[in-house]
């Protein structure tokens, strides 16, 4: 048999080998496709099947607009002018090339040593489903489940039967200072069909380094509070992913669960002291904030104690 590949919506003509080009002809076309349950013999006189498969005067079979349900086997049996029986057998597959794939929600930059979502590659309207592949600097990226992670999703349209593919790429770049170029390609896996490529995206990789700033905010401002009052300490860090935050009082760690906020309700003199927060990042060591002083006083009219937070209520690391 012969394998035939036809584009969805396009006409297809299958020739009946051995059939005389003009009537009288002795021939029989039969098909077994998604429209049939078994073999369907087509009437030479034509009929309701003509809209999907029609016998032409020269004995060939015309499929005016191939669809997914027309995939299957087509057979012709003809008797030639010399009375010899000739058989033709075709295996028909259909395809649809999707629109150009796109990288949606691309990253603006990447951070070395931590997982980064590069973007999601989307291809819409393919048949069969096909595959999406990622490329780094023009070379095929093979997901290893560690430094290179790909999350794939395939959906089929309930009416058209066409596929939408999504592929989300996450990478852990090893070093900063580089400018890798990522692209994605769609392939139907058919012979003589070149892959469709997205426009490439070039991203800067920066070293994680310390966060740009770790600030300790105190409420009330100045860190002076009357007995029974409440003090709120907030450790503000501009780092992704958010690090774990521990608290230190007078140089000793406080036995509390990690949290960027420390609440001291109904303070007494035992809560007085110097507080700081320590942020621990996965990619580098712990980082401590500047300290703030908490004073509990009856009058509340004293100025800031030495070493306490100034007017802004912020302790900023230079």
């Amino acid at each position: 048999g012969q394998n035939i590949t036809a584009r969805i919506g396009e006409p297809l003509v299958l020739s009946c080998k051995g059939a005389p080009k003009k009537p009288p002809q002795q021939l029989e076309w039969k098909l077994n496709t998604g429209r049939t349950e078994a073999w369907k013999v087509l009437s030479p006189q034509g009929g309701p099947w003509d809209s999907v498969a029609r016998i032409l005067p020269n004995g060939s079979l015309l499929l005016p607009a191939t669809g997914i349900v027309d995939e299957g086997t087509f057979r012709c049996r003809a008797t030639n002018r010399r009375g010899k029986e000739v058989k033709s057998n075709y295996r028909v597959r259909v395809y649809q090339i999707p629109g150009k794939p796109e990288i949606v929600d691309p990253a603006s930059e990447l951070t070395a040593s931590v997982p980064n979502k590069v973007g999601t590659c989307v291809s819409e309207g393919s048949y069969p489903a096909g595959t999406l592949s990622w490329h780094l600097d023009g070379k095929l990226l093979i997901p290893d489940g560690k430094e290179t992670l790909v999350k794939e999703e395939t959906r089929r349209h309930p009416e058209t039967g066409l596929f939408t593919l999504r592929s989300e790429l996450t990478v852990i770049p090893t070093q900063g200072g580089t400018h890798p170029t990522f692209s994605c390609s769609f392939s139907l896996g058919l012979p003589r069909r070149r892959p469709l490529n997205t426009a490439p995206i070039q991203l800067r990789v920066r070293e994680p380094g310390p966060p740009e700033g770790i600030q300790l905010l105190v409420e009330p401002e100045g860190g002076i509070v009357a007995p029974g009052g409440t003090v709120t300490l907030t450790c503000a860090i501009s780092a992704q992913p958010p690090p774990q935050v521990h608290w230190i009082k007078d140089g000793a760690p406080l036995p509390l669960a990690p949290s960027p906020v420390l609440l001291l309700p109904e303070v007494g003199h035992e809560d007085e002291g110097t507080y700081s927060c320590v942020a621990t990042h996965p990619s580098h060591g712990p980082q401590e904030s500047p300290p703030v002083s908490i004073r509990v006083t009856e009058t509340g009219d004293e100025g800031p104690a030495e070493g306490s937070v100034g007017e802004s209520g912020l302790g900023t690391l230079a």
Epitope: K40, S43, Q45, D50
Partner: antibody, heavy 119, light 107 residues
Framework: EVQLVESGGGLVQPGGSLRLSCAAS????????MTWVRQAPGKGLEWVAS????????YYPDSVKDRFTISRDNAKNSLYLQMNSLRAEDTAVYYC????????????WGQGTLVTVSS | DIQMTQSPSSLSASVGDRVTITCRAS??????VNWFQQKPGKAPRRLIY???NLADGVPSRFSGSRSGTDFTLTISSLQPEDFATYYC?????????FGGGTKVEIK
């Protein structure tokens, strides 16, 4: 909304001719085969003719072949049935319907037009 | 030509009854059978297409089934508006052939 409206029915003498029309709206006319079906008074339904979407291919039962001609004008979204050599047994309500092939078969019908063949 | 033998030609039933109408094709027609409902003075209305599929806007009490060349229309619980004549149609081959019809009357 799909609408099919037949016209052209009436009283005609045996041996006479009549042309029925069907005006289609609410769908892309040239995407569909079209069909005429008739129903004699108090009787069942009988297929009369079908035409493919381009109008290139027409189909008839033996009872009307060579007497009736189905045609279409896709620019006007119209279907026609030219009936010649009419006989008393052609008396019926004639319906136009959308489809007639294996993809879509008679999913929408017109209200019908009565043809009476009598002397 | 294909014959579509429809039975019964008429039946009497009450509201709430389960009603079954059958069409037998004289040769294999695959799934290419429709069912229609017709009320006096009105055009036929398609109920079931390709043997088992419910047409748009048709109540779910109507269903179609197939076993080889036997096709069945079932009304699970007959309603007052269901008293009408029902036809099957084969559209696998020309000439397109309708069954003779089944008139469903009030008992």
């Amino acid at each position: 909304e799909v609408q099919l409206v037949e016209s052209g029915g009436g009283l005609v003498q045996p041996g006479g001719s009549l042309r029925l029309s069907c005006a289609a709206s609410g769908f892309t006319f040239n995407n569909y085969w079209m069909t005429w079906v008739r129903q004699a008074p108090g009787k069942g339904l009988e297929w009369v003719a079908s035409i493919d979407n381009s109008g290139d291919n027409t189909y008839y039962p033996d009872s009307v072949k060579d007497r009736f001609t189905i045609s279409r004008d896709n620019a006007k979204n119209s279907l026609y049935l030219q009936m010649n050599s009419l006989r008393a047994e052609d008396t019926a309500v004639y319906y136009c319907a959308r489809g007639g092939d294996i993809r879509v078969s008679l999913d929408h019908w017109g209200q019908g037009t009565l043809v009476t063949v009598s002397s | 030509d294909i014959q579509m033998t429809q039975s019964p030609s008429s039946l009497s039933a009450s509201v709430g009854d389960r009603v079954t109408i059958t069409c037998r094709a004289s040769q294999d027609v695959g799934i290419y059978v429709n069912w229609f409902q017709q009320k006096p003075g009105k055009a036929p209305r398609r109920l079931i297409y390709r043997a088992t599929n419910l047409a748009d806007g048709v109540p779910s009490r109507f269903s179609g089934s197939r076993s080889g060349t036997d096709f069945t229309l079932t009304i699970s619980s007959l309603q007052p508006e269901d008293f009408a004549t029902y036809y099957c149609l084969e559209f696998d081959e020309h000439p397109l052939t309708f069954g003779g019809g089944t008139k469903v009357e009030i008992k």
